[in-house]
Interface confidence: low
């Protein structure tokens, strides 16, 4: 065992090349200089090292950089990145978007691993906020990224970054997240004309308050049922039958198919049956004529 610690004569690596594939683990350890490896990291990915050989290379880099790898090495890690633990990554200071892209590319097509999540966390914290270019990059690799953030973390997203958000990026967001994102979107798109504004804001409407829905109802937007069903129940309840009719336009007929589901069900229960009848859809469950309709805020005050 002892003689294995010294590099055999003539085996000392002068550069990182394919000849190293045939080295045993102990030979790699003994014959590859860590500083040489660090300067030629870009070559490692072109060489089909075994899983175990990659462990040796990682170990050499760990010994050379116990406080964490420099960005010049990190950018060229390639598949060696998959060997890193979240603990390793927490020691890094990644500032370049190109480095982030290079590492995300390695994991492309796979679900977000704890390593990737840690890398993103380090990168975003280093930048101080989730700027547009970063958001563009992250949502390109992980469409659900935005919805994996807590409302507190989303609060660091500047309104300008909202332009990078695509509808599918918000598919898994819950109301608490949309509550944070909607005001930013409203700010980001405020200078657009009516129809263009609606196209952009539509995905964020799950965070919209009643007043904004009332305003939209005056703009002939023809909201589709899928969007309507994602609205906050508490924002929909105060809308009148006439306002919902204007908001949905020709899509109002879809209410019938959704009458047992929230928020339609709860909204129906708050409307006068006479008003519902004016829609001609056969919606049932409204308040019969002659009954007092309590204001929602008053109801909450009484309970």
């Amino acid at each position: 065992e002892v003689e294995k610690t010294a590099c055999p004569s003539g085996k000392k690596a002068r550069e990182i090349d394919e000849s190293l594939i045939f080295y045993k683990k102990w030979e790699l350890e003994a014959c590859v200089d860590a500083a040489l490896l660090a300067t030629q990291m870009d070559r490692v990915n072109a060489i089909p090292f075994t899983y175990e050989q990659l462990d040796v290379l990682k170990h050499k880099l760990d010994e050379l950089y116990p406080q964490g790898y420099p960005e010049s090495v990190i950018q060229h890690l390639g598949y060696l990145f998959l060997k890193m633990s979240p603990e390793d990554i927490r020691k890094w200071n990644v500032t370049s978007l190109e480095t982030l892209k290079a590492l995300l590319e390695v994991n492309k097509g796979h679900e977000m691993s704890p390593q990737v999540a840690t890398l993103i966390d380090r990168f975003v914290k280093g930048r101080g906020q989730l700027d547009k270019d970063t958001l563009d990059t992250l949502t390109a690799f992980y469409p659900g990224y935005l919805c994996s953030l807590s409302p507190e973390e989303l609060s660091s997203v500047p309104p300008s970054s909202i332009w990078a958000v695509r509808p599918q990026d918000l598919d898994t967001c819950d109301p608490r997240q949309l509550d944070v994102l909607y005001p930013k979107a409203r700010l980001a798109f405020q200078n657009m004309n009516g129809s263009e504004y609606f196209v952009k804001i539509q995905s964020f409407l799950g965070g919209a308050p009643t007043e904004d829905l009332k305003a939209l109802s005056q703009q002939n937007v023809s909201m589709d049922l899928a969007t309507f069903m994602k609205l906050r129940t508490d924002a929909v309840l105060p809308l009148t039958v006439a306002e919902v009719q204007k908001l949905l336009g020709p899509h109002v007929e879809g209410l019938k198919a959704e009458e047992r589901h929230r928020p339609v069900r709860d909204w129906i229960l708050r409307q006068r049956q006479d008003d519902l009848d004016t829609l001609g859809l056969g919606l049932q469950g409204g308040i019969p004529n002659g009954y007092l309709v309590l204001d929602l805020s008053m109801q909450e005050a009484l309970s």
Partner: nanobody, 119 residues
């Protein structure tokens, strides 16, 4: 040091539900991300879900829509709500976290709780 104690495992029929808990004690103020990791019989460890101190969460694709991770910082407890359980979810489930001290990061694991999904 951090001590992690899991509970809530057991035998459940396919389609059933379980809620796992992991109580943390010791240097809990240093805890950042917490993980649920599982090991099926004869298989290696695989992470199931994790939650950051800020509350952002991730679950692996195979359990998405069925498992939900949460934590109650006031009780120093991590939870995993498992619904629509399948036979392939049978495994020992471990709670895992790390804390920095002494200049390095230290990993901590619970003893594990066995979840068996079988009819």
């Amino acid at each position: 040091e951090v001590q992690l104690v899991e509970s809530g495992g057991g035998l459940v029929q396919p389609g059933g539900s379980l809620r796992l808990s992991c109580a943390a004690s010791g240097s809990t103020s240093s805890i950042n991300t917490m993980y649920w990791v599982r090991q099926a019989p004869g298989k290696g460890l695989e992470w199931v879900s994790f939650i950051s101190s800020g509350g952002s969460t991730n679950v692996r694709d195979s359990v998405k829509g069925r498992f939900t991770i949460s934590r109650d910082n006031s009780k120093n407890t991590l939870y995993l709500q498992m619904n629509s359980l399948r036979a392939e979810d049978t495994a020992v489930y471990y709670c895992n976290t790390y804390i920095p001290y002494g200049g390095t990061l230290h990993d901590f694991w619970g003893q594990g709780t066995l979840v068996t999904v079988s009819s």
